[in-house]
C-alpha cells in the first residue's frame, strides 16, 4: 500500500487557449484531471487501474500552484493504492477549463480541454521527487512525483506491512526496509524475547523483562550460577543441584555430624589433650588432678585415695589428712605397730620380718596388693574394654564385659545378641525383641551370668569389740583386726595394752 | 525459653531399676556444649548431684553412685534419661533432670521435679 | 568429696533486714566455681547466683555473692517476703557436683 503523489508546479497558457485552438471567455479558468494507471506501451485511453483525481480550479491561463500540502491542501495529489507497487505506471494528466462551477466530466462541452499528456515509465519507492515538464504547442506545464509507501508499509514496493508494537505479541520499530529493529532489550524473530540480565547463565537462568535472572529449580544467585544444596545442608557445598558435598571434618546425609569436634568446638578444659572419636564425639584425655567428660572438674586430693591400710581421707583447706585405723600411723597410714606374730597379711599373704621385728612387710599372692594385701589388683586401670565395655577383675585377670552387639578378649568384635555366647559360666543365652538374657546356673549371677556368688564371711560380724573385719577371698574365711587392748581370732580376749609409742 | 519435664513411675519396688526420663523443650539436647544432668533430693533434706550426659553421649558419675548409674540421651526423642538400679528404701526423694551451660556446672534451667517413693 | 557446711541452719529477720548467708567449703574452690540457689517449697530450685559473684538473669541486685577460697557469702540487702525460702550453695568445681545442706530464710 502507498500514495503516489504529483506535484503540479506551473501552468503556461499565454494566449488563454483551449486545445482547439479557440480562445477562452474570459480566460482559461484552469483545473486538471489525473489518470493514473498500469504501465502502457502507448498509453491508450481505458480504466485508470492506479486511480484518478481532479482539483479544483487553480488558476487563470498561466499561473503557478501553490504547494498546499502543509495547509491541508490538494497539492500534491495523492493518489493511494493498496497493493504492491509494480516499480512501473502510465500517467494522464489533463487540462481543462471550467466555464462555470460544475466540474463534472458530463457538465462540461467536450471542447473544453486545455491539454492532455501522457507519460510512462519505471518509478521506484522513494521521498526523491522526479522533476518533469511537457510542453505542446500552446502550453507548457511544470510538475514533479514520486511513490512513497504508506503509513505502516515498506520496501521497494510497499509490500512490507510492518507497525511499530511494545506489547506482549513483541517490542519493536520498523526499519526503512521494513524490517524490525528490537527496542533496547529485547532480541528474536519478532523482538518477543527479553535480554536477560548480562551474565545470567544461558541454563539455569531465564527472565521474562530485560535485565532480569530468574532461576531455574535448583539454582540461585544473582546470575543463577550457584547450585542450591540439599535441604538442610549444614556444612556442605554442591556442583549440581540437591548435592550435598561435605566440608572438611564434617559428614552425614546433611554434612551436620562433626567428624572434627575438637578442632571445631575444643571442648577439653584445663589442658586436656582432645581426640576425635567418630561423628561428633570426642576423648578428653586428662591432665592429672582433673576428671569429668570434657576434664573440667577438679579431683580432690583425697580421689587419689592416698590413705594406706583403711584409713579414711578428709579433705582440708590446705589439702587433705588421713585418720588411721588401730595398728598404723604415719603420713598416709603407712607405718605399722604390729609384726609377723599378729598375722597381719590377708588374702594368704606371707610375712617377713623388718628391723629386728619392729617392722614387717607382705608378699602378696598375684591377685593382690596393698602393704597387707587388703587389695585386690585392678587390672582394669588401663581401660582395655573397647566399645564400651566394662572391665572386670577375675582374679589373677581381667575380663571384660561387652555392650550388647560386641564381642571377643576386649570387645572388639561386632556381632548380634547370642551368637556371640555372652553368657559366662555355661549360663543359657536367650534372645529377646531388644537384646538379650541370661539363665545363670548355681552359683552365679549378673546380667552375664559374670558374678561369683560367694560368701561373705564377714556378714555374720564375726569381730568383737569393735574390731575390722576382712574377708579372705581365697578361703572364703575372716580375718579380724583387732583394736587395742584384744587378742584372739575374733578380738574376744581382752589384754594389757601394750607400751606407749613416742609419737 | 528452654523448659525440662521429668517422668516416670512415682512407686518403685526395691530391688528394681528406676527409669526416668527428661524431655526437653524450647531447645535442643543435641546442640551446644550443655551438660544434662540428674540431681536427687531426699524429703526435707539437701541435693545430691548423680552425674550428665552430653550431646556427644560423654558420661560422667558421682563416683559414689557410679556403680548403680546409667545416663544416655536420644537425640531424635529430644531427652535424656537416668537408670538408678538396685532401688532400696533410702532412694525416695525427688528426682530433677538439669541443665548446666557450657564447661561450667550451675544449673540455670531445672525440671518441677519428680517424686519416686521405694516400697513394695 | 569437698563438703560444703552452711551456716546458719535457720535464719529469721524482719522484712527490710539485711540477710547474711555463709558458705565454707572443706578445701579451696578454685576459680570462683560457687552457685547459689533459692527453693520455696514444692519447687525446683532456682539459680540466684553463678561464679561466686555473677547475677543470673532476672535476679534483682538487693540479692549479692561475695567470697573465694573456702568462704562464700550470699546477701540479701534488703529483705522482702517473697524472699522466704530454702538456699543452698553449690560447688562445681570438684568432682562430684556437692550442694550445702541449706539455709532456711524466715520472715519473723
Known amino acids: 500500500s502507498g500514495v503516489f503523489q504529483l506535484q503540479l508546479q506551473e501552468f503556461i497558457n499565454e494566449r488563454g487557449v483551449l486545445a482547439s485552438g479557440r480562445p477562452c471567455e474570459p480566460g482559461c479558468r484552469t483545473f486538471f484531471r489525473v489518470c493514473l494507471k498500469h504501465f502502457q506501451a502507448v498509453v491508450s485511453p481505458g480504466p485508470c487501474t492506479f486511480g484518478t483525481v481532479s482539483t479544483p480550479v487553480l488558476g487563470t491561463n498561466s499561473f503557478a500552484v501553490r504547494d498546499d500540502s502543509s495547509g491541508g491542501g490538494r497539492n500534491p495529489l495523492q493518489l493511494p493504492f493498496n497493493f504492491t507497487w509494480p516499480g512501473t505506471f502510465s500517467l494522464i494528466i489533463e487540462a481543462w477549463h471550467a466555464p462555470g462551477d460544475d466540474l463534472r466530466p458530463e457538465a462540461l462541452p467536450p471542447d473544453a480541454l486545455i491539454s492532455k499528456i501522457a507519460i510512462q515509465g519505471s518509478l521506484a519507492v522513494g521521498q526523491n521527487w522526479l522533476l518533469d515538464e511537457q510542453t505542446s504547442t500552446l502550453t507548457r506545464l511544470r510538475y514533479s512525483y514520486r511513490v512513497i509507501c504508506s503509513d505502516n508499509y515498506y520496501g521497494d514496493n510497499c509490500s512490507r506491512l510492518c507497525k511499530k508494537r511494545n506489547d506482549h505479541f513483541g517490542h519493536y520499530v520498523c526499519q526503512p526496509d521494513g524490517n524490525l529493529s528490537c527496542l533496547p532489550g529485547w532480541t528474536g524473530e519478532y523482538c518477543q524475547q527479553p535480554i536477560c540480565l548480562s551474565g545470567c547463565h544461558e541454563q539455569n537462568g531465564y527472565c521474562s523483562k530485560p535485565a532480569e535472572c530468574l532461576c531455574r529449580p535448583g539454582w540461585q544467585g544473582r546470575l543463577c550460577n550457584e547450585c542450591i544444596p540439599h535441604n538442610g545442608c549444614r556444612h556442605g557445598t554442591c556442583s549440581t543441584p540437591w548435592q550435598c558435598t561435605c566440608d572438611e571434618g564434617w559428614g552425614g546425609l546433611f554434612c551436620d555430624q562433626d567428624l572434627n569436634y575438637c578442632t571445631h568446638h575444643s571442648p577439653c578444659k584445663n589442658g586436656a589433650t582432645c581426640s576425635n572419636s567418630g561423628q561428633r564425639s570426642y576423648t578428653c584425655t586428662c591432665r592429672p588432678g582433673y576428671t569429668g567428660v570434657d576434664c573440667e572438674l577438679e579431683l580432690s586430693e583425697c580421689d587419689s585415695n592416698p590413705c594406706r591400710n583403711g584409713g579414711s581421707c578428709k579433705d582440708q583447706e590446705d589439702g587433705y589428712h588421713c585418720l588411721c585405723p588401730p595398728g598404723y600411723y604415719g603420713l598416709h597410714c603407712e607405718h605399722s605397730t604390729l609384726s609377723c606374730a599378729d598375722s597381719p597379711c590377708f588374702n594368704g599373704g606371707s610375712c617377713r620380718e623388718r628391723n629386728q621385728g619392729a617392722n614387717y612387710a607382705c608378699e602378696c599372692p598375684p591377685n593382690f596388693t596393698g602393704s597387707n594385701c587388703e587389695k585386690k589388683v585392678d587390672r582394669c586401670t588401663s581401660n582395655p574394654c573397647a566399645n564400651g565395655g566394662q572391665c572386670l577383675n577375675r582374679g589373677p585377670s581381667r575380663m571384660c564385659r561387652c555392650r550388647p552387639g560386641f564381642t571377643g578378649t576386649y570387645c572388639e568384635l561386632h556381632v548380634s545378641d547370642c551368637a556371640r555366647n555372652p553368657c559366662a559360666h555355661g549360663g543359657t543365652c536367650h534372645d529377646l525383641e531388644n537384646g538379650l538374657m541370661c539363665t545363670c546356673p548355681a552359683g552365679f549371677s549378673g546380667r552375664r551370668c559374670e558374678v561369683r556368688t560367694s560368701i561373705d564371711a564377714c556378714a555374720s560380724s564375726p569381730c568383737f569389740n569393735r574390731a575390722t573385719c576382712y574377708t579372705d577371698l581365697s578361703t572364703d574365711t575372716f580375718v579380724c583386726n583387732c583394736p587395742y587392748g584384744f587378742v584372739g581370732s575374733r578380738c574376744e580376749f581382752p589384754v594389757g595394752l601394750p607400751p606407749s609409742f613416742p609419737w | 525459653q528452654v523448659q525440662l519435664q521429668e517422668s516416670g513411675p512415682g512407686l518403685v519396688k526395691p530391688s528394681q531399676t528406676l527409669s526416668l526420663t527428661c524431655t526437653v523443650s524450647?531447645?535442643?539436647?543435641?546442640?551446644?556444649?550443655?551438660?544434662w544432668s540428674w540431681i536427687r533430693q531426699h524429703p526435707g533434706k539437701g541435693l545430691e548431684w548423680f552425674g550428665y550426659?552430653?550431646?556427644?553421649?560423654?558420661?560422667y558419675y558421682n563416683p559414689s553412685l557410679k556403680s548403680r548409674i546409667t545416663i544416655s540421651v536420644d537425640t531424635s526423642k529430644n531427652h535424656f534419661s537416668l537408670r538408678l538400679s538396685s532401688m532400696t528404701a533410702a532412694d525416695t526423694a525427688v528426682y530433677y533432670c538439669a541443665r548446666a551451660g557450657s564447661g561450667s556446672h550451675y544449673f540455670d534451667y531445672w525440671g518441677q521435679g519428680t517424686l519416686v517413693t521405694v516400697s513394695s | 568429696e569437698t563438703t560444703l557446711t552452711q551456716s546458719p541452719g535457720t535464719l529469721s529477720l524482719s522484712p527490710g533486714e539485711r540477710a547474711t548467708l555463709s558458705c565454707r567449703a572443706s578445701q579451696s574452690v578454685s576459680s570462683s566455681y560457687l552457685a547459689w540457689y533459692q527453693q520455696k517449697p514444692g519447687q525446683a530450685p532456682r539459680l540466684l547466683i553463678y561464679g561466686a559473684s555473677s547475677r543470673a538473669t532476672g535476679i534483682p541486685d538487693r540479692l549479692s555473692g561475695s567470697g573465694s577460697g573456702t568462704d562464700f557469702t550470699l546477701t540479701i540487702s534488703r529483705l522482702e517476703p517473697e524472699d522466704c525460702a530454702v538456699y543452698y550453695c553449690?560447688?562445681?568445681?570438684?568432682?562430684?557436683?556437692?550442694f550445702g545442706q541449706g539455709t532456711k530464710v524466715e520472715i519473723k
Open positions: 524450647g531447645g535442643s539436647v543435641s546442640s551446644g556444649n550443655y551438660y
Open positions: 553449690q560447688q562445681y568445681g570438684y568432682s562430684p557436683i556437692t
Open positions: 550426659i552430653k550431646n556427644s553421649g560423654g558420661t
